[in-house]
């Protein structure tokens, strides 16, 4: 069951506030509050910002990275921090906002000829066509002159949604993050009722596609809060 997976199978070496409910792709019930949503803290305001403890960059939103909140602070206490914009200092690619990568300690723009996650060596895989894509996270690795032009197809390992092809987002799937399809009209989605509430979502869903929003399905209005079904609906 979902609970047994959460409580006993996925063992997180993380601080206490983790282990919220997880949304199954295609499940009949929307996930409970307290779930990491693609994009993470970027929808929060300063007023209601709640630090989200983490152990690795993948546990943070697409515009965040995992680090100690204070310079030279306790290495054991790490939270998701807002990504660094262009020309800001960095130590690894994940610290830089989407569209940028870390070069010589500074976040610089990823132009067409550069992949933000230039990595130690070529890690490509064939998709049975003439194109290939990065297979592996682009974080905590050294620079090289290798270049990548193509985006990850469905199922490819990713770090951020910008690593994935159009119509896909980067979402957690057990111990990896992979490119998954952006949700279509009528598909079950994950609605987060409380801004700033996070939990580690084992099967992260993508967000709803363009022109759609995640809303309670009309015939589920009478249901209890915990069992309301959310689907992607036209604005």
């Amino acid at each position: 069951t979902l609970n047994s997976v959460l409580n006993s199978n996925a063992i997180k070496n993380l601080p206490p506030p983790l282990g919220g409910a997880a949304g199954h792709p295609g499940s009949a019930v929307s996930a409970a509050p307290g779930i990491l949503y693609p994009g993470g803290n970027k929808y929060q305001t300063i007023d209601n910002y709640q630090p989200y403890p983490c152990a690795e960059d993948e546990e943070c939103g697409t515009d965040e990275y995992c680090a100690s909140p204070t310079r030279g602070g306790d290495a054991g206490v790490q939270i998701c921090l807002a990504c660094r914009k262009r020309r800001k200092r960095c130590m690894r690619h994940a610290m830089c906002c989407p569209g940028n990568y870390c070069k010589n300690g500074i976040c610089v723009s990823s132009d067409q000829n550069h992949f933000r996650g230039e990595i130690e060596e070529t890690i490509t895989e064939s998709f049975g066509n003439d194109h290939s894509t990065l297979d592996g996270y682009s974080r905590r690795t050294t620079l090289s002159s290798k270049m990548y032009h193509t985006k990850g197809q469905e199922g490819s390992v990713c770090l951020r949604s910008s690593d994935c092809a159009s119509g896909l987002c980067c979402a957690r799937h057990f111990w990896s993050k992979i490119c998954k399809p952006v949700l279509k009209e009528g598909q079950v989605c994950t609605k987060h009722r409380r801004k700033g509430s996070h939990g580690l979502e084992i099967f992260q869903r993508c967000y709803c596609g363009e022109g759609l929003s995640c809303r309670i399905q009309k015939d589920h209005h009478q249901a209890s809060n915990s069992s309301r079904l959310h689907t992607c609906q036209r604005h």
Partner: antibody
Framework: EVQLLESGGGLVQPGGSLRLSCAAS????????MGWVRQAPGKGLEWVSA????????YYADSVKSRFTISRDNSKNTLYLQMNSLRAEDTAVYYC???????????WGQGTLVTVSS | DIQMTQSPSSLSASVGDRVTITCRAS??????LNWYQQKPGKAPKLLIY???SLQSGVPSRFSGSGSGTDFTLTISSLQPEDFATYYC?????????FGGGTKVEIK
Amino acid sequence: EVQLLESGGGLVQPGGSLRLSCAASGFAFTTYAMGWVRQAPGKGLEWVSAISGSGSTTYYADSVKSRFTISRDNSKNTLYLQMNSLRAEDTAVYYCARSGSFLSFDSWGQGTLVTVSS
Amino acid sequence: DIQMTQSPSSLSASVGDRVTITCRASQSISRHLNWYQQKPGKAPKLLIYGASSLQSGVPSRFSGSGSGTDFTLTISSLQPEDFATYYCQQTYRTPLTFGGGTKVEIK
């Protein structure tokens, strides 16, 4: 070229312990989740455990939970499987494997045989 | 747990034959289905991931199809080196589970 080399297998008595190692080379180790899969003699494949790239997230099959511990040392490019309270049914060839697209295991080691017998 | 049922469990075929192996999941697994080939005394080798994507270096005579619960591995023209055991695997839910295997033997 991706290479995964397991070691640490052998004969052990029921209730005993073993630690398997998997030395990885030819790819950026920290960027990949890794896993262990086993195969009992003459039988099919059974997933045992997996660990995220950073090592912060681990998963286990129910049959080994609380007895086996997966870990990794990214500074040494090495994956481990600590096996305690071994049982006869744990006898198998243990493979270490790299987790790729769709969480498929896209590269495998040659395997190391673990025999649990009195 | 999600059960993966492969059929047939074994088959005999000749070089040049078209071979089809099926795999059925006990519940929908979308396209989270992978196929492996294993020869005696050797480690498994990934052939197909995501139901239909050919792994790098795998000959194009291998193809995969399906979505949901029913999947197929096809070898369009069997070659001598293809005689082996084939396994399907789902990665939609933990525990990850494999099919029982299909042994392809020489007729």
